[in-house]
């Protein structure tokens, strides 16, 4: 007899031969698979599975919970099912309350019936409360009621499955739709702190927030140009329902030179990245840098005001500063503040003010600024101008006529002679002899000039004027004198102020 | 059927306290809240608090904070307001109103009269 | 506060159709619900979310929404719908009920 090819591996047969059955509760359940390959039955129904060995199923009286899919798989992997329902009038509904919703997706409310033909199969909110406008929802008798694209705004909603039973309305268990968020944005990320200023061995904190709607962003800290896992700890709050903080503290217990770097807290989510970022400069000690705000060297007129502003860069914080002149300490006068209230900073600013000055306080300013570790100093160098002040004139046993005059700038001294009574004098006479009598003594104050001129040279009755200049002003003195005969008679001098 | 039947009027005195039952019956009592609702003569309807069957936690309007005490007898399927320290403005029909979408189903009304 | 808007009163010939208007800012978002009061007092909910009609009310009562103004429509008016008509919705997170002033139709 000639042998018959075997054909494709067919599936199983089940009897009863129907895609649906509906049993009574407390009634039998058989169902037979016909297969010479027989493997095994399985039950699933929510999530729970039973497997059975036998090729007949039996239950002798069944429940609402023995309500589901019935399927019969051979030794291809071929497979046949049957869905079973189990009519309890007590038990419309099988649940699983447990309910997740990812925002946007679809999410299943588990609430598959045991009788498929009760009517107006729906979702109800809990206590008759409308459900929100926007909610669709897609029933499937065999395993439970779709939510379409779930809302954020669906948190926290109580509803129940509904159904129709002999025209009376018969609700499920509640159920409380938890939704998990979806990132429609990326991480807020912040620094506690944009820098870091340490010695060695100093505690390195800082504490970066991530701010997101759920806890599953991912965050860390990093090292730039660095490969090294960072130590740090966590805290987290939920500040309501789609609103999570976490803060991750980065630590390095005793900071050294070689720590100095950027710092990133960095986070992501399914959205995308975000970070931020802190430097940290670890110095061996501290340290502080004086800038002058104006010339050291500072020229001021009698009688006028000046300030000598310092900026300086001070770590750690300056404990001691003061402003010397002829060790003297002002207790007055000056000023000292922080540059910005920023906590970073270090940087402040000291201000000396310097009122109505006298030629006499002309001299060395200096700013003394001190912290744990070292001290500075800046020294401003302040020449007063004042105008000449003719000190003496007068005609020496020589037959000279002498003038000395101090101001600052170095006077200049003139003469000039005017004949007759008039003070007008224009010819000017050349000194016989000038000398810069203080320039070897102190550096500051006025400088004393004195000038001669022989007056053998006058031939006729007159006045001599010594006229004391500089940029600030001038001022003058006269000699008159007159001829008696070939005799110079007299010589009376005295001084014009002529501004 | 469902149905919520309300308590029979009430005539009471300024300062006096007057409470009112709402009974219901046709569905399982816990599955749907009770509201109450105010109607002045010749006005329109004004809710006033809703109350958790299942939990007994009633949700109030602002105005009807205070003297007003919305109360369950699960037990009986029933709803009380209770309204203390009655005012002359307090005469109006008082609704309860339940059911499946909240206001399915109303009780005929119960009319408190607060008079001297 | 918030607020749902009706016209005082609306009038219609009998077996004609009227429509009634209920506005409110939220109406966009959370549902409309109408609710019949009879002269006698009695109340009865004609529509439930903005146009589901429950069982036992006639279908020439429906209703629809758009924007933010709901309406409730009658066709073929009878005496017998000669009532105070009061639109319901919510409104805040918590959902709270509030009720729209009242429509007084007078069928002629």
């Known amino acids: 007899q000639p042998s018959v090819s075997p054909g494709e591996p067919s599936p199983p047969s089940i009897h009863p031969a129907k895609s649906e059955l509906i049993v009574r509760v407390g009634n039998e359940i058989r169902l037979l698979c016909i297969d010479p390959g027989f493997v095994k039955w399985t039950f699933e129904i929510l999530d729970e599975t039973n497997e059975n060995k036998q090729n007949e199923w039996i239950t002798e009286k069944a429940e609402a919970t023995n309500t589901g899919k019935y399927t019969c798989t051979n030794k291809h992997g071929l497979s046949s099912s049957i869905y079973v329902f189990v009519r309890d009038p007590a038990k419309l509904f099988l649940v699983d309350r447990s309910l997740y919703g990812k925002e946007d997706n679809d999410t299943l409310v588990r609430c598959p019936l045991t009788d498929p033909e009760v009517t107006s199969y729906s979702l109800k909110g809990c206590q008759g409360k409308p459900l929100p406008k926007d909610l669709r929802f897609v029933p499937d008798p065999k395993a439970g009621i779709t939510i379409k694209s779930v809302k954020r705004a669906y948190h926290r909603l109580c509803l129940h499955c509904s159904a129709d039973q002999e025209g009376k309305s018969v609700l499920s268990d509640k159920f409380i739709l938890k939704v998990r968020p979806a990132f429609k944005a990326v991480p807020v990320v912040s620094v506690s702190k944009a820098s870091y200023l340490l010695r060695e061995g100093e505690e390195f904190t800082v504490t970066c927030t991530i701010k997101d709607v759920s806890s599953s962003v991912y965050s860390t800290w990093k090292r730039e140009n660095s490969q090294t896992k960072l130590q740090e700890k966590y805290n987290s709050w939920h500040h309501g329902d789609f609103n999570y903080e976490r803060q991750a503290t980065l630590t390095i217990s005793s900071a050294r030179v070689n720590d100095s770097g950027v710092f990133m807290c960095y986070a992501n989510n399914t959205f995308g990245s975000a970070n931020v970022t802190t430097t940290l400069e670890v110095v061996d000690k501290g340290f502080i840098n004086i800038f002058p705000m104006i010339n050291t060297t500072v020229f001021v007129n009698d009688g006028e005001n000046v300030d000598l502003i310092v900026e300086y860069e001070a770590f750690p914080k300056p404990e001691h500063q003061q402003w010397i002149y002829m060790n003297r300490t002002f207790t007055d006068k000056w000023e000292d503040y922080p540059k910005s209230e920023n906590e970073s900073n270090i940087r402040y600013v000291s201000e000396l003010h310097l009122t109505r000055l006298k030629g006499t306080e002309g001299g060395t300013y200096t700013f003394l600024v001190s912290n744990s570790d070292v001290n500075a100093s800046i020294a401003f160098n302040v020449y007063v101008n004042t105008k000449p002040e003719i000190l003496t004139y007068d005609r020496l046993v020589n037959g000279m006529l002498q003038c000395v005059a101090a101001g600052f700038p170095e006077p200049t001294i003139d003469w000039y002679f005017c004949p007759g009574t008039e003070q007008r004098c224009s010819a000017s006479v050349l000194p016989v002899d000038v000398q810069t009598l203080n320039a070897s003594g102190p550096p500051f104050g006025k400088l004393v000039v004195q000038s001669s001129i022989d007056s053998s040279a006058f031939k006729h009755n007159g006045t001599v004027e010594c006229k004391a200049y500089n940029d600030v002003g001038k001022t003058s003195a006269y000699f008159n004198f007159a001829f008696k005969g070939n005799n110079k008679e007299q010589i009376h001098p005295h001084t014009l102020f002529t501004p | 059927q469902i149905q919520l039947v309300q308590s029979g009027p009430e005539l009471k005195k300024p300062g006096e306290s007057v409470k009112i039952s709402c009974k219901a019956s046709?569905?399982?009592?816990?599955?749907?809240?009770i509201h109450w609702v105010k109607q002045a003569p010749g006005q329109g309807l004004r809710w006033m608090a809703w109350?958790?069957?299942?939990?007994?936690?009633?949700t109030y309007a602002d105005d009807f904070k205070g003297r007003f005490v919305f109360s369950l007898e699960a037990s009986a399927s029933t709803a009380h307001l209770q309204i203390s320290n009655l005012k002359n403005e307090d005469t109006a029909t008082f609704f309860c109103?339940?059911?499946?979408?909240?206001?399915?189903?109303w009780g005929q009304g119960t009319l408190v009269t607060v008079s001297s | 506060s918030y607020e749902l808007i009706q016209p005082p009163s609306a009038s219609v010939t009998l077996e004609n159709t009227v429509s009634i208007t209920c506005s409110g800012d939220?109406?966009?978002?959370?549902?409309a619900h109408w609710y019949q009061q009879k002269p006698d007092k009695t109340i009865l909910e004609v529509i439930y979310?903005?146009?589901e009609r429950p069982s036992g009310i006639s279908d020439r009562f429906s209703g629809s929404s758009s924007g933010t103004t709901a309406i409730l429509t009658i066709r073929d008016a009878q005496a017998e719908d000669e009532a105070d008509y009061y639109c319901?919705?919510?409104?805040?997170?918590?959902?709270?009920?509030?009720f729209g002033g009242g429509t007084k139709l007078t069928v002629l």
């Open positions: 109350i958790n069957t299942e939990t007994g936690k009633p």
């Open positions: 046709g569905y399982t009592f816990t599955d749907y809240a």
């Open positions: 979310n903005d146009s």
């Open positions: 939220e109406l966009s978002n959370k549902y």
């Open positions: 109103a339940g059911g499946s979408h909240w206001f399915a189903y």
């Open positions: 319901l919705s919510t409104f805040s997170d918590d959902d709270l009920p509030i």
